[in-house]
Interface confidence: low
Amino acid sequence: GCLTQLYENAFFRGGDVASMYTPNAQYCQMRCTFHPRCLLFSFLPASSINDMEKRFGCFLKDSVTGTLPKVHRTGAVSGHSLKQCGHQISACHRDIYKGVDMRGVNFNVSKVSSVEECQKRCTSNIRCQFFSYATQTFHKAEYRNNCLLKYSPGGTPTAIKVLSNVESGFSLKPCALSEIGCHMNIFQHLAFSDVDVARVLTPDAFVCRTICTYHPNCLFFTFYTNVWKIESQRNVCLLKTSESGTPSSSTPQENTISGYSLLTCKRTLPEPCHSKIYPGVDFGGEELNVTFVKGVNVCQETCTKMIRCQFFTYSLLPEDCKEEKCKCFLRLSMDGSPTRIAYGTQGSSGYSLRLCNTGDNSVCTTKTSTR
Amino acid sequence: IVGGTNSSWGEWPWQVSLQVKLTAQRHLCGGSLIGHQWVLTAAHCFDGLPLQDVWRIYSGILNLSDITKDTPFSQIKEIIIHQNYKVSEGNHDIALIKLQAPLNYTEFQKPICLPSKGDTSTIYTNCWVTGWGFSKEKGEIQNILQKVNIPLVTNEECQKRYQDYKITQRMVCAGYKEGGKDACKGDSGGPLVCKHNGMWRLVGITSWGEGCARREQPGVYTKVAEYMDWILEKTQSSDGKAQMQSPA
């Protein structure tokens, strides 16, 4: 189920799958929600630790049991991923942080009159992930009203420093507030060039596009279909970026499909989940559980309810069925995508709906924080 | 909203505008989306206009002037007014609207979480009231959704300010001693939300007040936590699953 309570002065021991710098616990929680394996997180505000390297540290954690031992740590904040939390799942983060400088690659500097204007510029720049703004009272006169647009390899700051008269925040592209607009077109038999930022396996180009949309550095993608000539590259989804923000070249290529991230769409973004079920397809991955259920939809529901489950395969092989119920293989991987996609099998596969934000899950569960 | 500022897109995605289409169309009240098919508002919004056909509910909007004849709106399937609401009193000023068709959630249109039943222990320090209502007592409906940060006031303090009215434990008050910031006409039914532990909760429903933003005259809101049983009972569908965002 959905758990939204935060634990103050508590830190989860062990289970680390990733770490990064975030300005507050809520942003850390959002990163945990969108990380394929993160179930729990712990955050260290600047006030909670003397070690400068660990200030603003956000630690993403996994656990086979869904929980980890809590240790007392003054000022630390811990909590749960919001996977399975329906409409609370959003990559949109509006907060502006005063007295904080979020570090990254500064690729654009301009003079603006307010921090809101700076955030708007970041939102309207295809490469900007976060920004810092030096206010009117910044100690160095030449930097006053400077708006620095930034990015980093992981989409989060490479460091966060406490600095007076500086305000920082994130792009509002995930809030569907970009003025850039987006390309909805899918280009058949076309491959894009430029830098690959990640490689995942997907059953179709639409899943590839959604993954690109929610990847911090993906601006466009190329998908190689299941009939692509090189077997080892079939169902490969290449997430790409470029200096200019658009592909520098494209090559006509049979059995490839290309397209763009939808992060810059106005007013509507795709859900960060994939609801389609793929008949005759087997998704390979690490086995989480096997259960007998009646029908592929129930298999998907079972996967969705099991928070660690990322995708599933429902087998219709006679040896995998007992009366009306057949085996439902609940699976996971390091990146949330299948490690293998096989065709012509007796069964169907699909993804967990744990990140769908239209669920009517009881997403507002609250328990008193332990203090 | 008196003393407020413009909101931005998707800042309050649960806020809806309840409009009446008679000869002309006008915004009458606010409301809060609490589920795909449910809006929570004030009972008094329907005083004399309880026929569902005349109402149009606009969600996912920021600027009322953007509404045209082509703007999609929701229609009402059912109005459920609290059984103890009496128009002669300010008590139980709460109503549920069931929409004819469920709404999809987007960044600009999604529900607000409800508080826990009888939530009295939480100390809310970051509360906001939103709406398109008057910006002064003798004002007019605003085009852009307004927001204002207002502190909660104890019921004891509130009762002192309203000697002629009974401030019950099922009401919550908010305002500044010096006035200047408040809800006003046209904000009724809309949300008083508070952010706690990073999560927004619907603490109150804009209900009434003496004038708007007057000194020592806080706004009075229906306390949602006190009506959780009623909300859950009324929103339970036939399969027994709550159709709104509620505490477990």
């Epitope: - | 005083d47 206009l49 009496k86």
Partner: antibody
Framework: EVQLLESGGGLVQPGGSLRLSCAAS????????MMWVRQAPGKGLEWVSG????????VYADSVKGRFTISRDNSKNTLYLQMNSLRAEDTAVYYC???????????????WGQGTMVTVSS | DIQMTQSPSTLSASVGDRVTITCRAS??????LAWYQQKPGKAPNLLIY???TLESGVPSRFSGSGSGTEFTLTISSLQPDDFATYYC????????FGQGTKVEIK
């Protein structure tokens, strides 16, 4: 004491005009939906028109639509009914009444004035 | 438009009688119905609203019931002060009155 006092009634010829006023006192006028209701001699009550507290919404009975205009001046605590193109069948006692939309609130017409007589005759 | 039909038009009764007046709406009005009492030369006086809620200060011998399209006003024991004309009024869509029921001395 809560009071509504209508004025402006009288004798008028068919096709003529008349403006009725209703002065309110003893309550916060701007909180209320105000109404005009009429009663022809020896007949029942007929709702004529209503205006919401801000004055933004006005509604009329079919029988007077296009001929009568309801308005209010919240600063003067006064309700008006401008009656044009008057007909013999408009002859009646005209009452103003209120329904509160502020605090406390009421469903039906709560307080009525004593009425003003309008006679349309040649 | 919603029409309201009251019956009977006239009712003759004696002090102490139980009196029932019926009001029928041309379409469902839920519980959005009020009852008024009017005496000659006077403005109407609200007795009951929301079909069954007694207005403060109104004697408990008056009661209302019904919902949808059928409503009744009952005076459990008629008093000398109760001889008057009674009107029902819907406020589901705009406002419409019934034609009235005159309660007179038998």
């Amino acid at each position: 004491e809560v009071q509504l006092l209508e004025s402006g009634g009288g004798l008028v010829q068919p096709g003529g005009s008349l403006r009725l006023s209703c002065a309110a006192s003893g309550f916060t006028f701007s909180h209320y939906i105000m109404m005009w209701v009429r009663q022809a001699p020896g007949k029942g009550l007929e709702w004529v028109s209503g205006i919401y507290s801000s004055g933004g919404i006005t509604v009329y009975a079919d029988s007077v639509k296009g001929r009568f205009t309801i308005s209010r001046d919240n600063s003067k605590n006064t309700l008006y009914l401008q009656m044009n193109s008057l007909r013999a069948e408009d002859t009646a006692v005209y009452y103003c009444a209120y329904r509160r939309t502020g605090i406390p609130r009421r469903d039906a017409f709560e307080i009525w004035g004593q009425g003003t007589m309008v006679t349309v005759s040649s | 438009d919603i029409q309201m039909t009251q019956s009977p038009s006239t009712l003759s009764a004696s002090v102490g009688d139980r009196v029932t007046i019926t009001c029928r709406a041309s379409q469902s009005i839920s519980s959005w119905l009020a009852w008024y009492q009017q005496k000659p030369g006077k403005a109407p006086n609200l007795l009951i609203y929301k079909a069954s809620t007694l207005e403060s200060g109104v004697p408990s011998r008056f009661s209302g019931s019904g919902s949808g399209t059928e409503f009744t006003l009952t005076i459990s024991s008629l008093q000398p002060d109760d001889f008057a004309t009674y009107y029902c009024q819907q406020y589901n869509t705009y406002w419409t009155f019934g034609q009235g029921t005159k309660v007179e001395i038998k």
